[in-house]
């Protein structure tokens, strides 16, 4: 599926704006804040009551090539005794990010932006109970 | 940059790595089956480490609007619905890529930017430091 276009004409275009062919945009993939690091609490994926594992997906035609995805380890949550409590649910928390896809058409190469959904971790929730009449 | 496998029949001059600057189609492809109804949007209330969502808008960024999570409590909600301070609510953070207009206000010129967002919260056992 396609979503509406990025970019428009409402900006008072400064003279410094680079010329861009119609239907496309210029994208610098030198990342701003490339070296910032996540200061998340230590190994929360193991200490969580809804623990998760990480897997790395790798795609050479994607930038960045590595995308890390989380998977909840259990259906239920871990209780104080370290046992799985199936009266609660471990559920994935997801966030959207952008990637650049490189496409080969014969010997020519084109680039496409994509929205990708990343599972970031898991949280423990009270289940929604549907009462059947 | 990253190495790209090349069609062996293509001229050898092609760069195998991603170039620093690329021209990208204005349409953004949606790889998510975004309307997955299983993907609940009420976890923030039902979680044992509930969070509030704060709206952050920046017209120079794509996406312009990002909703960020802030944990409601230091502790976690127990079976009785009370806050249990023997456990900790902590944010789950993720680095995501967004587009930043560069130069500013230019309609069709962007640079990738990495930003850190808090997506939700999870309940963890605290790390206990024993003082000698």
């Amino acid at each position: 599926r396609k979503i509406p276009k990025v970019g428009h004409t409402f900006f008072q275009k400064p003279e410094s704006c680079p010329p861009v062919p119609g239907g496309s945009m210029k994208l610098d993939i030198g990342i701003i804040n490339e070296n910032q690091r996540v200061s998340m609490s230590r190994n929360i994926e193991s200490r969580s009551t809804s623990p998760w594992n990480y897997t790395v997906t790798w795609d050479p035609n994607r930038y960045p090539s590595e995308v890390v995805q989380a998977q909840c380890r259990n259906l239920g949550c871990i209780n104080a005794q370290g046992k799985e409590d199936i009266s609660m649910n471990s559920v994935p928390i997801q966030q959207e990010t952008l990637v650049v896809r490189r496409k080969h058409q014969g010997c020519s190469v084109s680039f496409q932006l994509e929205k990708v959904l990343v599972t970031v971790g898991c949280t423990c929730v009270t289940p929604v109970i549907h009462h059947v009449q | 940059g990253i190495t790209i496998p090349r069609n062996p029949g293509c001229p050898n001059s092609e760069d195998k790595n991603f170039p620093r600057t690329v021209m990208v189609n204005l349409n953004i492809h949606n790889r998510n089956t975004n309307t997955n109804p299983k993907r609940s949007s009420d976890y923030y209330n039902r979680s044992t480490s509930p969070w509030n969502l704060h709206r952050n808008e920046d017209p120079e960024r794509y996406p312009s609007v990002i909703w960020e999570a802030k944990c409601r409590h230091l502790g976690c909600i127990n079976a009785d619905g009370n806050v249990d301070y023997h456990m900790n609510s902590v944010p789950i953070q993720q680095e995501i890529l967004v587009l930043r207009r560069e130069p500013p206000h230019c309609p069709n010129s962007f640079r990738l930017e990495k930003i850190l967002v808090s997506v939700g919260c999870t309940c963890v056992t605290p790390i206990v430091h024993h003082v000698a």
Epitope: I3, P4, F10 | S41, Y44, L53, P59, V65, W67
Partner: antibody, heavy 121, light 106 residues
Framework: QVQLQQSGAELVRPGTSVTLSCKAS????????IHWVKQTPVHGLEWIGV????????FYNQKFDGKAELTADKSSSTAYMELRSLTSEDSGVYYC??????????????WGQGTSITVSS | QIVLTQSPAIMSASPGEKVTMTCSAS?????IYWFQQKPGTSPKRWIY???ELASGVPARFSGSGSGTSYSLTISSMEAEDAATYYC?????????FGGGSKLEIK
């Protein structure tokens, strides 16, 4: 084509609550926030608040915090606004409108037809 | 909150006449949005991000301004332009609307 179909007019008693609905069609529901606007002859157009169907996030104009509760159901592409503890001051026409999350300069581009609420004993 | 003051509150113009209405903000804002509303209908987005005409809006309409002073201009009034026009800001919470400028045809 894009449509925001709102529920019908309501005549309600003071002190009660009412829930208005706004069914979206013709676009990806979760790509847009739903904003709600009130219109009266005295106060004109007033922004009530916003609901993000994707995350469930809500943000309110302080004036309507506690008066309105905004929710959305992704499976039916429907947004809801509950108005509580109604008084005659809550009478007016209520509109839902969509707002593109990705490029905010488009603003509130499509509006529902409005729901008229009359609070009277 | 940012107060948007529209003037004139009511105006009338003959067909072919040039029309200008203004919107003054109590604090500086980034962009202004204009909505057209006719009796018994919902507001329609008319001009967005100060300058841009919404889809289907005739080219005789234009928007301009910056900071605290904005305007909507019709180069040559037509009967179908008779309506109330509201300005709107979303630079600061709570988002606010002007009181409206009612444009009538002579």
């Amino acid at each position: 084509q894009v449509q925001l179909q709102q529920s019908g007019a309501e005549l309600v008693r003071p002190g009660t609550s009412v829930t208005l609905s706004c069914k979206a069609s013709g676009y990806i529901f979760t790509d847009y926030e739903i904003h709600w606007v009130k219109q009266t002859p005295v106060h004109g157009l007033e922004w009530i608040g916003v609901n993000d169907p994707e995350s469930g996030g809500t943000f309110y104009n302080q004036k309507f915090d506690g008066k309105a509760e905004l929710t959305a159901d992704k499976s039916s592409s429907t947004a809801y606004m509950e108005l509580r503890s109604l008084t005659s001051e809550d009478s007016g026409v209520y509109y839902c409108t969509r707002y593109y999350r990705y490029e905010s300069f488009y603003g509130m581009d499509y509006w529902g037809q409005g729901t008229s609420i009359t609070v009277s004993s | 909150q940012i107060v948007l003051t529209q003037s004139p509150a009511i105006m009338s113009a003959s067909p072919g006449e040039k029309v200008t209405m203004t919107c003054s903000a109590s604090s500086s804002i980034s962009y202004i949005y204009w909505f057209q509303q006719k009796p018994g209908t919902s507001p329609k987005r008319w001009i967005y991000a100060t300058f841009e005409l919404a889809s289907g809006v005739p080219a005789r309409f234009s928007g301009s301004g910056s900071g605290t002073s904005y305007s909507l201009t019709i180069s040559s009034m037509e009967a179908e332009d008779a309506a109330t026009y509201y300005c709107h800001q979303r630079s600061s919470y709570p988002w606010t609307f002007g009181g409206g400028s009612k444009l009538e045809i002579k």
